[in-house]
């Protein structure tokens, strides 16, 4: 005859206040005949939680129909969990006795602990923007979880990062814990559209991790490249000079033209275009009147990007004698 075994598969059961907890217990034999009781704790002070034969237990229901022939499932559900319900629960088989039942075998016990879900991770980037090839730090915080064991991962565009440091506080026993992690990310020029993700996995989340995100667009500054060119064709007595400001981010940009060191106040035509990588291009056209020009006209395109020091590009205007003659012949 097979010897009866009491199986309680879960060592730890995490429950949330107000919810229903299911404590599993199965037996491997109907014999010896006698009730299965549930207790919290051990020893003489243990608390009776459920007795299939005697008493009434309003908060407890059985998972299976105990009256079904050959039933070997003595799992129970406890409703409306409160902090007072934490402890280790044992299913215990008793042998029918006269006048008293005799304890026969106990299960290994299931510890019921209150689990608390971590808050949604909050990811914060650097206070100031940084240029590509430099390293920036992102922090991720999540609070209020229990138990203490938690897993945190960082990703950049789906690729897992390895350069990060994580702390869980407090180190000792607590009702709830917090996690803080700092990741170091090297910026690439194309990171305007990139994202960093902080992913938190916890037993209370049932395999569905929480994620916090930050856009690298908030952390990156891509400085522009400048190119000033003179258009070969002229319009009447005017030469068109173009200043192309390429691949910059963010959009914040001030452009000024200077003629031989004198800032020009007049209106200039310009267009702004967005590149696939999220950076911008700005093109500005400046019309120079050459009817009475000297040969040594120097045009400067100066760009101030995102509050940084201005960068400029100069162009010495090339006006041929032929062009001058043409222009002096032109009617006003």
């Amino acid at each position: 005859e097979e010897e009866l075994q009491m199986i309680q598969p879960e060592k730890l059961l995490l429950v949330t206040v107000g919810k229903t907890a299911t404590l599993h217990c199965t037996v491997t034999s109907l014999l010896p005949v006698g009730p299965v009781l549930w207790f919290r704790g051990v020893g003489p002070g243990r608390e009776l939680i459920y007795n299939q034969k005697e008493g009434h237990f309003p908060r407890v229901t059985t998972v299976s129909d105990l009256t079904k022939r050959n039933n070997m499932d003595f799992s129970i559900r406890i409703s409306s969990i409160t902090p007072a319900d934490v402890g280790t629960y044992y299913c215990v088989k008793f042998r029918k006795g006269s006048p008293e039942n005799v304890e026969f075998k106990s299960g290994p016990g299931t510890e019921m602990a209150l689990g608390a879900k971590p808050s949604a991770p909050v990811v914060l980037g650097p206070a100031a923007r940084t240029t590509p090839e430099h390293t920036v730090s992102f922090t991720c915080e999540s609070h209020g979880f229990s138990p203490r064991d938690i897993t945190l991962k960082w990703f950049k565009n789906g690729n897992e990062l390895s350069d990060f440091q994580t702390n869980v506080d407090p180190t000792g026993q607590s009702v709830a814990y917090s996690i803080r992690s700092t990741a170091r990310v090297v910026l690439d020029p194309w990171d305007v559209r990139s994202q960093v993700i902080c992913e938190v996995a916890h037993v209370t989340l049932q395999g569905d991790p929480l994620r916090g995100t930050a856009n690298l667009s908030e952390a990156i500054r891509v400085p522009p490249t400048l190119e000033v060119t003179q258009q070969p064709m002229r319009v009447g007595n005017q030469v068109n000079v173009t200043c192309q400001v390429r691949k910059f981010y963010p959009q914040s940009l001030q452009l000024t033209w200077s003629e031989n060191g004198n800032v020009c106040q007049r209106e200039t035509a310009s267009t702004l275009t967005e590149n696939k990588d999220g950076t911008y291009n700005w093109t500005s056209w400046f019309l120079v009147n050459i009817s009475d020009q000297r040969d040594d006209v120097v045009l400067t395109c100066q760009v101030k990007h995102d509050g940084q020091l201005a960068v400029s590009k100069r162009l010495a205007l090339e006006v041929t004698v032929h062009q001058k003659d043409q222009s002096s012949d032109a009617t006003p």
Epitope: V33, E54, N70
Partner: antibody
Framework: EVKLEESGGGLMQPGGSMKLSCVAS????????MNWVRQSPEKGLEWVAE??????????HYAESVKGRFTISRDDSKSSVYLQMNNLRAEDTGIYYC????????????WGQGTTLTVSS | DIVLTQSPASLAVSLGQRATISCRAS??????????MYWYQQKPGQPPKLLIY???NLESGVPARFSGSGSGTDFTLNIHPVEEEDAATYYC?????????FGGGTKLEIK
């Protein structure tokens, strides 16, 4: 101490009706299936009826010989089980025992002392 | 219905000897490895008393000289050594299916 005490027996004429009662004590009555078994010299021990728990929707089962004439019922608040017997016949004569089923398997571990029903004209 | 046939109908056994009572079912009363057969003892003026449950398990408070065996359709109650107080009628009962039925009884006399 588990006790089952039957009452309601007596002498009845064929075609008559009678209700047997059984009061239980010493255990949580509502957690046990309850049965009636009768005994006569002619038929020996004969299972009559069974009533299950509230969680079983108080399901009832009967021996073919009493089906449609006898009704088993229970009142958990009074720890009592009843057997309403209608259209009585001479062959219903016997000692009626109220029984606790210990393990939901006709495991008849406690029997009352019995109450005697005699059906005769 | 499952019919239980007990034999012998009566037997006389000397004090200290073995009494063997047989119960045969018209259909198997065993399922899932368990044998749904019970044995009772009844003395005059008393209700039956459970001795053996699930064919071979001694009910609490019952002396160890009582034992049960068998499976399927054939079951046996043994009493050894028989004592004076064992004089009674013994019944088998099954719970293999509804309706539950009892054997006709075996009257044991002590010589």
């Amino acid at each position: 101490e588990v006790k089952l005490e039957e009452s309601g027996g007596g002498l009845m004429q064929p075609g008559g009706s009678m209700k047997l009662s059984c009061v239980a004590s010493g255990f949580t009555f509502s957690n046990y299936w309850m049965n009636w078994v009768r005994q006569s010299p002619e038929k020996g021990l004969e299972w009559v009826a069974e009533i299950r728990l509230k969680s079983n929707n108080y399901a009832t089962h009967y021996a073919e010989s009493v089906k449609g004439r006898f009704t088993i019922s229970r009142d958990d608040s009074k720890s009592s089980v009843y057997l309403q017997m209608n259209n009585l016949r001479a062959e219903d004569t016997g000692i009626y025992y109220c029984i606790r089923d210990y393990d939901y398997d006709a495991y008849f571990d406690y029997w009352g002392q019995g109450t005697t029903l005699t059906v005769s004209s | 219905d499952i019919v239980l046939t007990q034999s012998p109908a009566s037997l006389a056994v000397s004090l200290g000897q073995r009494a063997t009572i047989s119960c045969r079912a018209s259909k198997s009363v065993s399922t899932s490895g368990y044998n749904y057969m019970y044995w009772y003892q009844q003395k005059p003026g008393q209700p039956p008393k459970l001795l053996i449950y699930l064919a071979s398990n001694l009910e609490s408070g019952v002396p160890a000289r009582f034992s049960g065996s068998g499976s399927g359709t054939d079951f046996t109650l043994n009493i050894h050594p028989v004592e004076e107080e064992d004089a009674a009628t013994y019944y088998c009962q099954h719970s293999g299916e509804l309706p539950y039925t009892f054997g006709g009884g075996t009257k044991l006399e002590i010589k």
